[in-house]
């Protein structure tokens, strides 16, 4: 009889075991285990009748189509075999064990005791057949195995071979190299590769196979396994395989498809091809006069581009438009996209106008082309070029006038300062105790008129100032402080300020320049209680033209000591000139006591200690600070007075040979102007040089040489 066994392990014993088995008995055990397992059989006890070639009693182990072993007896002899320690392994998942005893047994034989178990098959080690083994990596597990692929490969649907995804390769460059995947290593199996060469219309693709060409083939059938096909429009070239590469192919098309197919077997190294675009040839090019073309080639084909440029100092001219370079291109029909342009000499055109300056041409015919030269100069004697610049500009290759120091920036004509058009007389007679000034003697002198219409009734007063540049007036802060009913420092509105320059006689303003204010700047620390920091600036709405009657005064060097004691200075103004009029009378009578003609006086600087002492001896707050100095005579008689406020106290600087503003008329008192031992007090300008330059928006270093020349 037959016993079916499906367990993963078990025990098989001869009938009656451990007693002797009966005669004339036959039992078959069919053992089946799952796929991926084999069966291992071994015997713990074996005692059968011995016979030649096991003819009588035996145990036969077999598979469906193969006898694995036949055992009998007790000991192995030449003609009979006992299992002993031997293990029987089935090749597959099925094993059949048959026990047979004949009709007679001369002795009692105890039979056998066998055990079986399912054991895992290591398919990775045992698969020799290429058709069944993994292409790249094999992974065994109990009851089975699986395959995997190297990086960049994909497992085929057969779960065994490794293919690549190579159906999406687009080539758009004019030249390139295409290879089979992994070249020169063997190409992957089960793959369909598609390579597209897509160039611009007008190009034609030429193919050339190189180096190794090795695609699996067949001796009789053309390329049944692996192959290359080349598709050009509707036409298909190939298939190609074997070890002989195809001849170079001229496709006559700008669009080419290369198909490469591999089946699931074989180890071939693949292929490599280079492609290049061919196009129509364009005519030879001649560079323009004073120019060149790049790149310079013997031949130019479709899509080649050349850049036309000109020598230094020349510009490309195309259709009356100037440019630095011009590009032309070889077209698909073999013509150039444009004619070669010409090279035209750079023209800097008419140079920019220089404010307060002139231009002279150094080159004949007033040429403005490349390397031409011009010279800027300032309107002397009223303006001088900043930093003593040469003023020489050359027409550069870029088409701009260039100066070695300033580059493309124009020079600056700064107003000359401290040089009156007529010399001040050395002898000044004994403003109070002064004398009439000749026109042009104090060209920096400004009359500042303030008409405060925000007050009821309208307030009107005047003061003096000093021209520092074409746009700025220096004066005392108290002149430009709103004459309020309290001691708050608030500047007057710029709308209420008018400045007169070049004025000699206040009755005749026709020859004077009058200007409104763009800004009124009081020193931020101006103190109304003691007139400390009594300094201010007015920026004019428009720069004033300089001339013999309108010229700036120079600012001093930054020196805290201020003017040296006993130095003589000049001060001018339209203030009270009559020593018999009292200050109270002036205050009550408004502007009627103004002097018609500009007056001036020569006064010595008073030692600081002497001045301080003279004021400290008075009752009231008469402090003379380090930001002030005094000038005048002990005996009186000559002084500045009300209405001269803000005017410049100028001293001649021997070093620079210029007049420098050292002081601004600030205050005095309490006695009448010109009284004995009542010195005029002036703002010490040298303490404020930095502040002045800062407000005017010029760094001091730029203009310092004004008083150093």
């Amino acid at each position: 009889h037959t016993v079916e066994l499906n367990n993963m392990f078990g025990q098989i014993q001869s009938p009656g075991y451990p007693d002797s088995y009966p005669s004339d008995s036959e039992v078959t055990w069919n053992i089946t285990v799952p796929d991926g397992f084999r069966i291992k059989l071994y015997f713990m006890h074996f005692n059968l009748e011995s016979s030649y070639l096991c003819e009588y009693d035996y145990v036969k182990v077999e598979t469906e189509d193969q006898v694995l072993a036949t055992f009998c007896g007790r000991e192995t002899t030449d003609t009979e075999q006992t299992p002993g320690q031997e293990v029987v392994l089935s090749p597959g998942s099925f094993m059949s064990i048959t026990f047979r005893s004949d009709f007679s047994n001369e002795e009692r034989f105890t039979g056998f005791d066998a055990h079986y178990m399912a054991v895992d098959v290591d398919e990775c080690k045992e698969r020799e057949d290429e058709e069944l083994s993994c292409d790249h990596y094999c992974h065994n597990y109990i009851g089975g195995y699986y395959c995997s692929c190297r990086f960049g490969y994909i497992l085929h649907t057969d779960n065994r071979t490794c293919r690549v995804e190579c159906s999406d390769n687009l080539f758009t460059q004019r030249t390139g190299v295409i290879t089979s995947p992994d070249f020169p290593n063997p190409y992957p199996k089960s793959s369909e590769c598609l390579y597209t060469i897509e160039l611009e219309e007008g190009f034609m693709v030429n193919l050339q196979f190189e180096d190794i060409f090795d695609i699996e083939d067949h001796p009789e059938v053309p390329c049944p396994y692996d192959y290359i096909k080349i598709k050009v429009g509707p036409k298909v070239l190939g298939p190609f395989c074997g070890e002989k590469a195809p001849e170079p192919i001229s496709t006559q098309s700008h669009s080419v498809l290369i198909l490469f197919h591999s089946d699931n077997s074989g180890e071939n190294r693949g292929w490599r091809l280079s492609y290049r675009a061919a196009g129509n040839e364009c005519p030879e090019l001649q560079p323009p006069v004073h120019g060149k073309i790049e790149p310079s080639q013997a031949k130019y084909f479709f899509k080649d581009q050349v850049l036309v440029s000109c020598d230094t100092g020349y510009k490309v001219l195309k259709d009356n438009v100037e440019m630095d370079t011009f590009q032309i291109e070889c077209l698909k029909d073999g013509t150039w996209s444009n004619k070669i342009p010409t090279c035209k000499i750079v023209d800097c055109r008419a140079p920019g106008e220089l404010e307060h300056g002139l231009i002279t041409f150094s080159t004949r015919n007033n040429l403005t082309t490349y390397k031409s030269e011009i010279k800027y100069s300032c309107q002397e004697p009223y303006y001088k070029m900043l930093n003593n610049n040469t003023g020489i500009y050359t027409c550069s290759a870029q088409g701009v006038w260039m100066n070695k120091v300033l580059g493309r920036s124009l020079p600056t004509c700064l107003p000359e300062c401290g040089q009156p058009s007529r010399s001040l007389p050395s002898l000044v007679k004994r403003i109070i105790g002064g004398r009439n000034a000749e026109p042009g003697l104090f060209p920096w002198q400004a009359l500042i008129v303030v008409e405060d219409t925000s007050r009821v009734p309208n307030d009107k007063w005047f003061g003096s100032g000093a021209l520092l540049s074409a746009s700025w007036i220096l004066t005392a802060a108290h002149v430009l402080r709103s004459q309020r009913r309290d001691t708050t420092v608030i500047p007057v509105s710029k709308e209420h300020v008018t400045v007169y320059l070049g004025l000699h006689d206040v009755r005749d303003k026709s020859g004077a320049v009058n200007s409104s204010a763009a800004r009124v700047v009081l020193h931020p620390d101006f103190n109304i209680q003691n007139y400390n920091h009594d300094i201010a600036l007015v920026q004019l709405q428009e720069p004033v033209p300089l001339g013999p009657h309108v010229m700036p005064v120079c600012l001093p060097r930054l020196e805290p000591e201020g003017p040296a004691p006993h130095m003589l200075g000049l001060v001018a103004g339209w203030g009270i000139s009559n020593p018999n009029v009292t200050v109270d009378e002036i205050i009550s009578s408004g502007t009627r006591t103004l002097s018609d003609v500009l007056q001036y006086v020569k006064l010595p600087v008073v030692p600081h200690a002497e001045c301080k002492t003279s004021y400290e001896s008075r009752s009231g707050n008469y402090s003379v600070t380090e930001n002030m100095f005094c000038a005048g005579y002990y005996e009186g008689g000559k002084d500045t007075c009300l209405g001269d406020s803000g005017g410049a106290f100028v001293i001649f600087d021997d070093l620079s040979q210029r007049w420098v503003v050292q002081g601004l008329v600030s205050w005095g008192g309490p006695e009448e102007c010109g009284s004995k031992q009542v010195y005029g007090v002036y703002t010490k300008v040298s303490n404020y040089v930095d502040w002045v330059w800062e407000q005017m928006g010029l760094p001091q270093s730029v203009v310092e040489p004004q008083v150093e020349r």
């Epitope: 925000s454 009821v456 108290h478 004459q483 309020r484 009913r485 309290d486 001691t487 708050t488 608030i490 509105s493 109304i528 209680q529 003691n530 007139y531 200050v583 205050i587 009231g620 707050n621 008469y622 205050w667 008192g669 309490p670």
Partner: antibody, heavy 114, light 112 residues
């Protein structure tokens, strides 16, 4: 013509704050200062502070400098006086004046009562 | 701080008579540079804001009748109403503007 129009009367609890407005017209607001003065019922005038709209400069009476805040909005030509931590003795009419006291607002009565 | 003291606290004057109010400051209000005394006089009628009469101690505000005059310098100042009118009944204040602002306590002027 020049006019200063103040906001209406306010009743506040002790500890609260009050903000009085003063809208100017008829002159250039930024060219002059605004003063604030108060007058308690039956009492004299007491200066609070001063503001200059052109640059937001302020000056305060020491008595009020920790509690009063003066501000301006030049876009609407309006000045403001805010008084914080109110107490009953802050009950007063609050005036604004401009152009150096030539023009005055009509006054705003602020009553501080619990 | 500058302290301002007015005298008398109240004053009764017959119509057409002169009325004089004094004001004393704790320090000089004369600025030696501008040569001005920073003192002003105000008139306040019931329910109205103050009205500026005099500034710089003696300058009359525009539109103020010339019966009002101011005098004094330094620390002592006077407001004079040369001929009292019925409409002059009010409280008068002096104010210093030399250093910030301080008002006097006020002087009440009535008709006798």
């Amino acid at each position: 013509q020049v006019q200063l129009v103040q906001s209406g009367a306010e009743v506040k609890k002790p500890g609260a704050s009050v903000k009085v407005s003063c809208k100017a017209s008829g002159y250039t607001f930024t060219t002059d200062d605004i003063n604030w003065v108060r007058q308690a019922p039956g009492q004299g005038l007491e200066w609070i502070g001063w503001i200059y709209p052109r640059d937001d400069r302020t000056k305060y009476n020491d008595k009020f400098k920790d509690r009063a805040t003066l501000t301006v909005d030049t876009s609407s030509n309006t000045a403001y006086m805010e008084l914080s931590s109110l107490r009953s003795e802050d009950t007063a009419v609050y005036y604004c004046s401009s152009l150096e006291d030539t023009y005055w607002g009509q006054g705003t009565l602020v009553t501080v009562s619990s | 701080d500058i302290v301002m003291t007015q005298s008398p606290d109240s004053l009764a004057v017959s119509l057409g008579e002169r009325a004089t109010i004094n004001c004393k400051s704790s320090q000089s209000l004369l600025n030696t540079r501008t040569r001005k005394n920073y003192l002003a006089w105000y008139q306040q009628k019931p329910g109205q804001p103050p009205k500026l009469l005099i500034y710089w101690a003696s300058t009359r505000e525009s539109g103020v009748p010339d019966r009002f005059s101011g005098s004094g310098s330094g620390t002592d100042f006077t407001l004079t109403i040369s001929s009292l009118q019925a409409e002059d009944v009010a409280v008068y204040y002096c104010k210093q503007s030399y250093n910030l602002y301080t008002f006097g306590q006020g002087t009440k002027v009535e008709i006798k």
